[in-house]
Interface confidence: medium
C-alpha cells in the first residue's frame, strides 16, 4: 500500500523536512503532490510526468520544494504555515490511481532556559524554596530534573505556574542536590545549567567509629566521631566529664584497664546554633593466652581409630570454637563435641579427615585462634590398577605394566607371573616378549603401616593371531527417541584397528552414529526402530583379523496410532461388525476397546453379531506398550441403519 | 485537428473473429495513451480496454479479458483490437479514444465515430 | 471491481432550468471522476474531468463537483443543445462508466 513517511513529523522551523514515499508502484506514468487531505487542482504543489522527466509547478509552488524522481518530496526552510496534510496523486502506466496523505507539524527551536531561585541557603525543617524556569515560552513543556533524574514523587514537592516553578517545601539535607529545567516542544528540548542548593542542617547525633567498645591491653585506642551538619561541625572530646581536646579525632597509645570510662564526643554548628553529644563506654581487658590442639592419635587408621583432639588450655567461662578446613564444622554424625565444646572426637577416621583443623577461645573483644593440626590418616591399600590397559600383544613387542594403589604411607609393590615372585618394584618391564609370556600377571600392594595388602591379576596374551572379539553393549533394550547405545569391541589390544559394520556393510554417514575410544566405541544418539539391525565388529593389525558374532540391537518402540480395519463406518442393521486394531509396536502392545467411552474387552479384534441402530457411536481402539511406558489411541465413528434405508451402505462380515 | 477513424467492423459469427483498427492523426500519437469503448444498440457506454504509448502497459475489462488483445503500431498511426471467441454480448459500436497527456491520462478527450460490430449466426 | 450508480435514470426539464445529475461510487474514488455528452449517433463528449475542472471548449453553464463517492454535474440554465443521455466515469480503477442519465425536453 502507498503510504507516505514524514521525517521529521515534528519539523523545527528553517529545518527542511522529507515526505518520504514508501510502496510507489512500478510502471508509473506520472505523480502530484497537493497541499491537504485530497487531491485539489487549485492547492496543487508540483506535477512530475515520468515519460517527460518534467516537472510542472502548480498554484500552491513556493519555490521550497523539490521532488525527487522516486516521487518523495523534501520542503526546505519551513515556516509555520507549512504544518498539516499533504497529499501525493500516482498515476500508474495501466491508468489505475492511488492516492496517500502524510502530515507533518512545524515548531520553533528554544533558548536555552535558567533558573531563579527565591533562597540561596534555606535551613533544613525550617525553610521553603521556589525555583522558577526562565523564560516564560508559549507552547513549551517544562520539565525538571534533581541530580539529573526525573522529579521524585513526594508531597513537599509541587509544582505550579504551569511546571515552570519548582516549590519544595520545609527542605531538608536530601534536597541538597543539582537542579536543572529543561524546555521541550517536538522539535527541541534545551536544558538549564545545574543550581545547586546548598540547605543549612545539622548537627546529627555524633557516631563514634569504631563501633567495639571492648579492647585489650597495649592496644592504641583511636576513636573518630562524625555527625551529618552543614557547614561542617566543629568536635570536642570528653573522658569521664572532663575536657581533653577539640579535635575530631582521640587518639591513646598504649592503653590499659585505667582507660576504661565513659567516652563523650559534642559536635557544634557555628550556622544553626545547635550543639549534640554521644557517650560510648570503652572497657579494657587483659591479654588471654593463644590456644594449641593436642591429639590422642597422630597416626590413626582410615575405618579403624577414633581421634580426639583438644583445645588447651582449660580456661573457665570461655567458649571454644573449631574449624575444619578454614570453614565452621560441619554437621556429620562421625564428629562429635564434648559438653563444653573443648574435645572434637572423629568416629572411624577416613582419609578426607586430614584436615586442617583449628581450635579457638573467644573472650569479649575477639576469637584468639590455634596453629592448625593436620591429621596423619594412615589408609590402604586400595585395589591396584595396572595400566596400561591392554590385554593382547604381539610377540616382539615390549611389555611395560605399572602398578598403582592409593595408599598412606605409599604402598610397597610386588610383581607375580602365574603365582611365581618376579620382583619389588612398581613396574614390570619384559622386553622382546613371546608366546611363552603370555599368563596371569598380579600385582600386590602392600601397606607396612596399615599391614594390610591387596592384589589385582591381569590376563596377559601373547599371540600373532588376533582373538575373535566380542560385543558389549550398555543398553540391551533401548527406547526410541529416548535412549543412546553404545557398543564396544573387547578385548582392547595394543595396535589394533577396530572395524564396524551394520548388517553387513559399512557403518553409515549419519549425525546420530559416533565412534570414539580409538574406534573401539560405537554409539547411537536417539535410537530409531531402523536402527535394529546386526551390528558386527572386527579388529586387526598387520598379521591378522577377525570379526565378532553380530549383535542384533533390540529396540523398542511404539506403540504407533493404531489403524481401524475395515474401514467402513456404515453397516446395515443385522450384519455382523468385526474390527480390529493393529499397532507398529516393539514388543506387540496390549488392545482394550471403548465403544462411547464404556470399556470393553482387552482383545485386538471386537466383534459385535447382528448390530442394530443402538450400537451407533464412537469406537475407540487403546494401545499401551509396557516396555516404552507409551499410549496411544484411535476413534471411529460407526453408523448403523434400519435395512433397506440406506443403499451402498456396507453389508458387514 | 485531432481525428480518430475506426474501420474493420462488421458480421460476424459467434465463436469467429474480427480486427479493428483506428487510423490516428492531428497529434503525436507515439507519447498518447490510447483506449477503446464500446456501446451496445439501445445501451449504455462500457470502457473495454486501455494501451501505453510504448504498448508495455495494457489494461482490460473483465467482460473480454483473454479474449480481445489491444495492440498498436507507433510508426502507422494506428491503434489495433483483435477480437477472438466473439459472443452475441459483443454486439456494439466500437470507439476509440485518446487519453491527454497532461496533466495525466485519467479521462478520454477525443473520440473516433465508432464501427458497427454484429455477432450473429 | 468499482460500481457506478447514476440517478435519476431520465429526467424531463425545460430551457432555462437549472438541472442536477449525482453519480454514486461504490467505494471512494477521490476526485477520478469524469462527465461525458452524448447525442443520438454521435460520439461521447467529454464535459468535466478530475471532478470539477472544466474541459477547453466546454460552455461555463456546466459545472461538476464531489470527492470520494459522491459527485454531482450541474447545468445552470439548460439550453436547447444540452438535451442529450449524460455519463459518468470513474478513473480510479480503469475506468467504468454509469448507466447514464438521459435528459429529455419536459
Known amino acids: 500500500k502507498l503510504t507516505i513517511e514524514s521525517t521529521p513529523f515534528n519539523v523545527a522551523e528553517g529545518k527542511e523536512v522529507l515526505l518520504l514515499v514508501h510502496n510507489l508502484p512500478q510502471h508509473l506514468f506520472g505523480y502530484s503532490w497537493y497541499k491537504g487531505e485530497r487531491v485539489d487542482g487549485n492547492r496543487q504543489i508540483i506535477g512530475y510526468v515520468i515519460g517527460t522527466q518534467q516537472a510542472t509547478p502548480g498554484p500552491a509552488y513556493s519555490g521550497r520544494e523539490i521532488i525527487y524522481p522516486n516521487a518523495s518530496l523534501l520542503i526546505q526552510n519551513i515556516i509555520q504555515n507549512d504544518t498539516g496534510f499533504y497529499t501525493l496523486h500516482v498515476i500508474k502506466s495501466d491508468l489505475v490511481n492511488e492516492e496517500a496523505t502524510g502530515q507533518f507539524r512545524v515548531y520553533p527551536e528554544l533558548p536555552k532556559p535558567s533558573i531563579s531561585s527565591n533562597n540561596s541557603k534555606p535551613v533544613e525543617d525550617k525553610d521553603a524554596v521556589a525555583f522558577t524556569c526562565e523564560p516564560e515560552t508559549q507552547d513549551a513543556t517544562y520539565l525538571w530534573w534533581v541530580n539529573n533524574q526525573s522529579l521524585p514523587v513526594s508531597p513537599r514537592l509541587q509544582l505550579s505556574n504551569g511546571n515552570r516553578t519548582l516549590t519544595l517545601f520545609n527542605v531538608t539535607r536530601n534536597d541538597t542536590a543539582s537542579y536543572k529545567c529543561e524546555t521541550q516542544n517536538p522539535v527541541s528540548a534545551r536544558r538549564s545549567d545545574s543550581v545547586i542548593l546548598n540547605v543549612l542542617y545539622g548537627p546529627d547525633a555524633p557516631t563514634i567509629s569504631p563501633l567495639n567498645t571492648s579492647y585489650r591491653s597495649g592496644e592504641n585506642l583511636n576513636l573518630s566521631c562524625h555527625a551529618a551538619s552543614n557547614p561542617p561541625a566543629q568536635y570536642s572530646w570528653f573522658v569521664n566529664g572532663t575536657f581533653q581536646q577539640s579535635t575530631q579525632e582521640l587518639f591513646i597509645p598504649n592503653i590499659t584497664v585505667n582507660n576504661s570510662g565513659s567516652y563523650t564526643c559534642q559536635a557544634h554548628n557555628s550556622d544553626t546554633g545547635l550543639n549534640r553529644t554521644t557517650v560510648t563506654t570503652i572497657t579494657v581487658y587483659a591479654e588471654p593466652p593463644k590456644p594449641f590442639i593436642t591429639s590422642n592419635n597422630s597416626n590413626p587408621v582410615e575405618d579403624e581409630d577414633a581421634v580426639a583432639l583438644t583445645c588447651e588450655p582449660e580456661i573457665q567461662n570461655t567458649t571454644y570454637l573449631w574449624w575444619v578446613n578454614n570453614q565452621s564444622l560441619p554437621v556429620s554424625p562421625r564428629l562429635q563435641l564434648s559438653n563444653d565444646n573443648r574435645t572434637l572426637t572423629l568416629l572411624s577416621v577416613t582419609r578426607n579427615d586430614v584436615g586442617p583443623y583449628e581450635c579457638g577461645i573467644q573472650n569479649e573483644l575477639s576469637v584468639d585462634h590455634s596453629d592448625p593440626v593436620i591429621l596423619n590418616v594412615l589408609y590402604g591399600p586400595d585395589d591396584p590398577t595396572i595400566s596400561p590397559s591392554y590385554t593382547y600383544y604381539r610377540p616382539g613387542v615390549n611389555l611395560s605394566l605399572s602398578c598403582h594403589a592409593a595408599s598412606n604411607p605409599p604402598a610397597q609393590y610386588s610383581w607375580l607371573i602365574d603365582g611365581n615372585i618376579q620382583q619389588h618394584t612398581q613396574e614390570l618391564f619384559i622386553s622382546n616378549i613371546t608366546e611363552k609370556n603370555s599368563g596371569l600377571y598380579t600385582c600386590q600392594a602392600n601397606n607396612s603401616a596399615s599391614g594390610h595388602s591387596r592384589t589385582t591379576v591381569k590376563t596377559i596374551t601373547v599371540s600373532a593371531e588376533l582373538p575373535k572379539p566380542s560385543i558389549s553393549s550398555n543398553n540391551s533394550k533401548p527406547v526410541e527417541d529416548k535412549d543412546a547405545v553404545a557398543f564396544t569391541c573387547e578385548p582392547e589390544a595394543q595396535n589394533t584397528t577396530y572395524l564396524w559394520w551394520v548388517n553387513g556393510q559399512s557403518l553409515p554417514v549419519s549425525p546420530r552414529l559416533q565412534l570414539s575410544n580409538g574406534n573401539r566405541t560405537l554409539t547411537l544418539f536417539n535410537v530409531t526402530r531402523n536402527d535394529a539391525r546386526a551390528y558386527v565388529c572386527g579388529i586387526q593389525n598387520s598379521v591378522s583379523a577377525n570379526r565378532s558374532d553380530p549383535v542384533t540391537l533390540d529396540v523398542l518402540y511404539g506403540p504407533d496410532t493404531p489403524i481401524i480395519s475395515p474401514p467402513d463406518s456404515s453397516y446395515l442393521s443385522g450384519a455382523n461388525l468385526n474390527l480390529s486394531c493393529h499397532s507398529a509396536s516393539n514388543p506387540s502392545p496390549q488392545y482394550s476397546w471403548r465403544i462411547n467411552g464404556i470399556p470393553q474387552q482387552h482383545t485386538q479384534v471386537l466383534f459385535i453379531a447382528k448390530i442394530t441402530p443402538n450400537n451407533n457411536g464412537t469406537y475407540a481402539c487403546f494401545v499401551s506398550n509396557l516396555a516404552t511406558g507409551r499410549n496411544n489411541s484411535i476413534v471411529k465413528s460407526i453408523t448403523v441403519s434400519a435395512s433397506g434405508t440406506s443403499p451402498g451402505l456396507s453389508a458387514g462380515a | 485537428e485531432v481525428q480518430l477513424l475506426e474501420s474493420g467492423g462488421g458480421l460476424v459469427q459467434p465463436g469467429g473473429s474480427l480486427r479493428l483498427s483506428c487510423a490516428a492523426s492531428?497529434?503525436?500519437?507515439?507519447?498518447?495513451?490510447m483506449g477503446w469503448v464500446r456501446q451496445a444498440p439501445g445501451k449504455g457506454l462500457e470502457w473495454v480496454s486501455s494501451?501505453?504509448?510504448?504498448?508495455?502497459?495494457?489494461s482490460y475489462a473483465d467482460s473480454v479479458k483473454g479474449r480481445f488483445t489491444i495492440s498498436r503500431d507507433n510508426s502507422k498511426n494506428t491503434l489495433y483490437l483483435q477480437m477472438n471467441s466473439l459472443r452475441a454480448e459483443d454486439t456494439a459500436v466500437y470507439y476509440c479514444?485518446?487519453?491527454?497527456?497532461?496533466?495525466?491520462?485519467?479521462?478520454?478527450?477525443?473520440w473516433g465515430q465508432g464501427t458497427l460490430v454484429t455477432v450473429s449466426s | 471491481d468499482i460500481q457506478m450508480t447514476q440517478s435519476p435514470s431520465s429526467l424531463s426539464a425545460s430551457v432555462g432550468d437549472r438541472v442536477t445529475i449525482t453519480c454514486r461510487a461504490s467505494?471512494?474514488?477521490?476526485?477520478?471522476l469524469n462527465w461525458y455528452q452524448q447525442k443520438p449517433g454521435k460520439a461521447p463528449k467529454l464535459l468535466i474531468y478530475?471532478?470539477?475542472s472544466l474541459q477547453s471548449g466546454v460552455p461555463s453553464r456546466f459545472s461538476g463537483s464531489g470527492s470520494g463517492t459522491d459527485f454531482t454535474l450541474t447545468i445552470s440554465s439548460l439550453q436547447p443543445e444540452d438535451f442529450a443521455t449524460y455519463y459518468c466515469q470513474q478513473a480510479g480503477n480503469p475506468h467504468t462508466f454509469g448507466q447514464g442519465t438521459k435528459l429529455e425536453i419536459k
Open positions: 479514444a485518446r487519453y491527454p497527456s497532461v496533466p495525466f491520462p485519467l479521462h478520454l478527450d477525443y
Open positions: 467505494q471512494s474514488i477521490s476526485s477520478y
Open positions: 478530475a471532478a470539477s
Open positions: 494501451i501505453g504509448s510504448g504498448s508495455y502497459s495494457t
Open positions: 492531428g497529434f503525436t500519437f507515439s507519447s498518447s495513451y
